[in-house]
């Protein structure tokens, strides 16, 4: 969480941002809140990006003001206009691109004063893994697949029964570049699997950590997946 204060002759207002991550090709949110004002027409929101000389987005007098928007954000940004009056200056960023990563500033002007806060935005690709029993294999084998990751993640297998065991000798992980030549499909195979055990396939890069669990018994197979974004800090 980053909390910023204005430093003008006017009073300062508190602006709060939260570091976040965007999944390339999907829509993302850059979070920013501020002390609200009673009049929408008195609120100005400017989003800026370090190293980019045009604006990311501007909202003033109750509507978008895009004359100074940088080309790299053309047609991809929006604020939640109906929530500005209650102090929400968050930015929706459509079709997140790798180059969107960087330091953003949420700058606010209201009748009470000015304030700003920075936000670190990471971009990459992350997806839920799915673990299945590979019936085609000669021995009991598990196959963990996740369709989109970037940068290249690490894959670690774990088991409930053999806690702390190192499965690197009995697993094989491959990364296959997807058609857009950035993200990769992750496939990891675990051999010599025993029945009545829960196995976890953990995929992690500096943006996200995802886990796919599979419980294999003689009578059933249970699966569960979980994804967590890393480094979501507020400012």
């Amino acid at each position: 969480l980053i909390i910023g204060f204005g430093i003008s002759g006017r009073h300062s207002i508190t602006v709060t941002t939260v570091a976040s991550a965007g999944n390339i090709g999907e829509d993302g949110i850059l979070s920013c809140t501020f002390e609200p004002d009673i009049k929408l027409s008195d609120i100005v929101i400017q989003w800026l990006k370090e190293g980019v000389l045009g604006l990311v987005h501007e909202f003033k007098e109750g509507k978008d003001e895009l004359s100074e928007q940088d080309e790299m954000f053309r047609g991809r940004t929006a604020v939640f206009a109906d929530q500005v009056i209650v102090g929400n200056a968050s930015l929706r960023l459509k079709n997140v691109q790798l180059t969107d990563a960087g330091t953003y500033k949420c700058y606010i002007i209201t009748s009470k004063g000015k304030g700003n806060a920075n936000l670190e935005y990471k971009t990459g690709a992350f997806s839920m893994p799915e673990v299945n029993v590979d019936y085609n294999a000669s021995s009991e084998t598990l196959r963990c697949e996740a369709p989109r990751w970037f940068p290249q993640p690490t894959v670690v297998w774990a088991s409930q029964v053999d806690q702390g065991a190192n499965f690197s000798e009995v697993s094989n992980t491959s990364f296959e570049l997807n058609s857009e030549n950035v993200t990769m499909k992750v496939v990891s195979v675990l051999y010599n699997v025993t029945i009545n055990n829960t196995y976890s396939c953990m995929i992690e890069n500096d943006i996200a950590k995802a886990t796919g669990d599979i419980k294999v018994t003689e009578s059933e197979i249970k699966r569960r997946s979980h994804l967590q974004l890393l480094n979501s800090k507020a400012s």
Epitope: G51, L53, G54, S67, Q69, D70, E71, R74, G75
Partner: antibody
Framework: QVQLVQSGAEVKKPGASVKVSCKAS????????MNWVRQAPGQGLEWMGR????????NYAQKFQGRVTLTVDTSTSTAYMELSSLRSEDTAVYYC?????????WGQGTTVTVSS | DIQMTQSPSSLSASVGDRVTITCRAS??????LNWYQQKPGKAPKLLIY???RLHSGVPSRFSGSGSGTDYTLTISSLQPEDFATYFC?????????FGQGTKLEIK
């Protein structure tokens, strides 16, 4: 007030290179992109590329890619445009122009003549 | 690249006339359309940016309108100093592209 002052006219032989300068004053040099636009005699305007003075990052028009180099010297608030492998069709007035989306201030222009 | 087609290429008019120049883009340029005036031997000067915003110091007889692909520059009452060449330019996407120009001459 904002001013962009360009270097003087140049006469070059085919195959040579030319480097034109554009000295900015009256504003913070690193706050605005610097574009380069040329105009052949009696012709229209042609955008060549732009440079981000704060990062040195560049964008070039496809037509000039590999032949034009845009640089800046932030210590003197000066932008440079170097065009190599000159041919007669490069005879034109070369302008520097400030900003993104539109060009609010222009240099006075530098005439480059390419002749054997 | 986005193609910009300006018309007419030349135009004769008298002082006091109302004049309109049009510019058509080959695709939607989301109002990122600018107009410049250029006099012989001089650099272009920005008149209007973002379709209809008057650049500082530009007389109010100049106005711009349009949306999507079609844009217009209007001079409500021509003054002697307005006889020049006018260019449109799209700033929606790189590379910037310009119309071929409209030469406004005295009738």
């Amino acid at each position: 007030q904002v001013q962009l002052v360009q270097s003087g006219a140049e006469v070059k032989k085919p195959g040579a290179s030319v480097k034109v300068s554009c000295k900015a004053s009256g504003y913070t040099f690193t706050d605005y992109y610097m574009n380069w636009v040329r105009q052949a005699p009696g012709q229209g305007l042609e955008w060549m590329g732009r440079v981000n003075p704060s990062s040195g990052g560049t964008n070039y028009a496809q037509k000039f890619q590999g032949r034009v180099t845009l640089t800046v010297d932030t210590s003197t608030s000066t932008a440079y445009m170097e065009l190599s492998s000159l041919r007669s069709e490069d005879t034109a007035v070369y302008y520097c122009a400030r900003r993104h989306n539109y060009a609010d201030f222009w240099g006075q222009g530098t005439t480059v003549t390419v002749s054997s | 690249d986005i193609q910009m087609t300006q018309s007419p290429s030349s135009l004769s008019a008298s002082v006091g006339d109302r004049v309109t120049i049009t510019c058509r883009a080959s695709q939607d340029i989301s109002n990122y359309l600018n107009w410049y005036q250029q006099k012989p031997g001089k650099a272009p000067k920005l008149l209007i940016y973002y379709t209809s915003r008057l650049h500082s110091g530009v007389p109010s007889r100049f106005s711009g309108s349009g949306s999507g692909t079609d844009y217009t520059l209007t001079i409500s009452s021509l003054q002697p100093e307005d006889f020049a060449t006018y260019f449109c330019q799209q700033g929606n996407t790189l590379p910037w592209t310009f119309g071929q120009g409209t030469k406004l001459e005295i009738k």
